[in-house]
C-alpha cells in the first residue's frame, strides 16, 4: 500500500483470476476506483472495477483469461495499482509488486458427493477447481463436519496433508443429519492462504438396524 491508512491485498487462484480487496480509512467521496494489472513479462494488461463490500472496503476480480487457462507462472511479477478517479484524472491510491505464486488462494472445492453412507460412517469425495497443474500433488485439505446442535466454528478441523480428494468420516451417530465442508491450500507461497470453504454437503447417516444395540 502507498500509506498506512490503506490496505491492498490480492490473491491468485493459480489459473486466470486475481482477486483483490482494497480498504481505506476515512470514507472516500463517491468516486470510481479500479485495479490495474501490468505483468512484467506478458503482453496483456487487465483492469477491474472496484465495488464496495463494506463502508471502507472495495473488491474486484481481475479475469485474466478462460477459467482453466494458465496465465501466470512462478517467475511472473505483476504490478497491481489501485487507481481512483479525481476530476477527470486518475490518482494512484496503492501499489504492489505482486508475485502470484507467493499469494495463492484457490477456488473452493466443488462437486462434493456422498460416495457411500452407513450408520456410523460416510465416505465423501470432491474435486478441486481451477487449480494449476504446477502443484502436482502438493496440496493439503481441511475438512469439518457440522453436527446437530453445534456451529461451524465449533466443528473440529480434520487435516489431510496430501492431495486426497476424499474422506471417510467415522464415529457418526445413526439416523442423524450432518453437513460437511472442505477447503484446499497449496503448500507453495509465503502468503498463500486457505481457499474459501466449499458449499456445505448435507447427508444423513443410515438408521441403526431394528433389534440391534
Amino acid at each position: 500500500a502507498v500509506n498506512g491508512t490503506s490496505r491492498f491485498t490480492c490473491f491468485y487462484n493459480s489459473r486466470a483470476n486475481i482477486s483483490c480487496v482494497w480498504s481505506q480509512d476515512g470514507a472516500l467521496q463517491d468516486t470510481s476506483c479500479q485495479v490495474h494489472a501490468w505483468p512484467d513479462r506478458r503482453r496483456w494488461n487487465q483492469t477491474c472495477e472496484l465495488l464496495p463490500v463494506s463502508q471502507a472496503s472495495w473488491a474486484c476480480n481481475l479475469i485474466l483469461g478462460t477459467p482453466d487457462s494458465q496465465k501466470l507462472t512462478a517467475v511472473d511479477i505483476v504490478t497491481l495499482r489501485v487507481m481512483c478517479r479525481e476530476g477527470v484524472r486518475w490518482r494512484m491510491m496503492a501499489i504492489q509488486d505482486f508475485k502470484p505464486f507467493e499469494n495463492l488462494r484457490l477456488m473452493a472445492p466443488i462437486s462434493l458427493q456422498v460416495v457411500h453412507v452407513e450408520t456410523h460412517r460416510c465416505n465423501i469425495s470432491w474435486k478441486i477447481s481451477q487449480a494449476s497443474h504446477y502443484f502436482e500433488r502438493h496440496l493439503e485439505f481441511e475438512a469439518r463436519t457440522l453436527s446437530p446442535g453445534h456451529t461451524w466454528e465449533e466443528a473440529p478441523l480434520m487435516t489431510l496433508k496430501q492431495k486426497q480428494e476424499w474422506i471417510c468420516l467415522e464415529t457418526l451417530t445413526p439416523d442423524t443429519q450432518y453437513e460437511f465442508q472442505v477447503r484446499v491450500k497449496p503448500l507453495q507461497g509465503e502468503f498463500t492462504t486457505w481457499s474459501p470453504w466449499s458449499q456445505p454437503l448435507a447427508f444423513r447417516t443410515k438408521p441403526a438396524a431394528l433389534g440391534k444395540d
Epitope: G4, R89, M92
Partner: antibody, heavy 121, light 112 residues
C-alpha cells in the same frame, strides 16, 4: 517540443460569451489532460477545471459551474474553453495547461501563452 | 476549498543572496494516498507560469538546483540558495491534493 498555442485577445460585452482555443502539438493530444487557469488583472491564479481529450470527460470548478464549457476537437488537437454570461470580473488572462492523465506527480507541466479576455460595456 | 496563503507578498532580494517564501494551507494537504501534492510555479514578467517544484520537494526537469522545496502538512517553504536575475517574477504555491485545486496569492520576488 511540447507547445500549446492559444487564440488571440478578445473584447466582449457583459452578458456575452467567449470561446478560447488551445492548439496542442509535440505530444499525443489524447494522452493528456488540458486544464484551464485564469488570472484576473494583477491577481493570482484560479483553476477553472479540465478536460480529458481522450474521452471528452470534463470536471469544472464549482465556482464556474453552469457558466463554463470545455470541449475538444481531437482531429485538430485543439481544446476549447467557453465562458458565458460574462461580467467585468471575468476580465482576465486565460491559460490552458497540459497535465498527466494520472496525477502521480504534478498538475500542470506545460502552459499556453495565455489569452486576454476583456469584458467591457 | 483549501485556501493557500503565501508570505511575504513582496520579497526584495540581493543578487547572489538566499531567498525564502512561505506557503500555508488552511487544512492538511496530505492526500489519502499518503502523498502531498504541493507544487511551486514561477511566473516571470510577461510570461506564462512554469512548474518548478512538485510533491513538496521534487525539482521539475530543467529547474536549477538552487531551488528547493520543503515542508509537510500545512506549512511549506520554497528556498532559492543564491538568487539570480532570471529568478525575478511571481512565485505561486499550488495544492493538488483536494479538488478544487487552489493556488496561493503569489509572492513577487524583485531585485533590490
Amino acid at each position: 517540443e511540447v507547445q500549446l498555442v492559444q487564440s488571440g485577445a478578445e473584447v466582449k460585452k457583459p452578458g456575452a460569451s467567449v470561446k478560447v482555443s488551445c492548439k496542442a502539438s509535440g505530444y499525443t493530444f489524447t494522452d493528456y489532460v488540458i486544464s484551464w487557469v485564469r488570472q484576473a488583472t494583477g491577481q493570482g491564479l484560479e483553476w477553472m477545471g479540465e478536460i480529458y481529450p481522450g474521452d471528452g470527460n470534463t470536471y469544472y470548478n464549482e465556482m464556474f459551474k453552469g457558466r463554463v464549457t470545455m470541449t475538444r476537437d481531437t482531429s485538430i488537437s485543439t481544446a476549447y474553453m467557453e465562458l458565458s454570461s460574462l461580467r467585468s470580473e471575468d476580465t482576465a488572462v486565460y491559460y490552458c495547461a497540459r497535465g498527466s492523465y494520472t496525477y502521480d506527480n504534478y498538475a500542470m507541466d506545460f502552459w499556453g501563452q495565455g489569452t486576454t479576455v476583456t469584458v467591457s460595456s | 476549498d483549501v485556501v493557500m496563503t503565501q508570505s511575504p507578498l513582496s520579497l526584495p532580494v540581493t543578487l547572489g543572496q538566499p531567498a525564502s517564501i512561505s506557503c500555508r494551507s488552511s487544512q492538511n494537504i496530505v492526500h489519502s494516498n499518503g502523498n502531498t501534492y504541493l507544487e511551486w510555479y514561477l511566473q516571470r514578467p510577461g510570461q506564462s507560469p512554469r512548474l518548478l517544484i512538485y510533491k513538496v520537494s521534487n525539482r521539475f526537469s530543467g529547474v536549477p538546483d538552487r531551488f528547493s522545496g520543503s515542508g509537510s502538512g500545512t506549512d511549506f517553504t520554497l528556498k532559492i540558495s543564491r538568487v539570480e536575475a532570471e529568478d525575478v517574477g511571481v512565485y505561486y504555491c499550488f495544492q493538488g491534493s483536494h479538488i478544487p485545486w487552489t493556488f496561493g496569492g503569489g509572492t513577487k520576488v524583485e531585485i533590490k
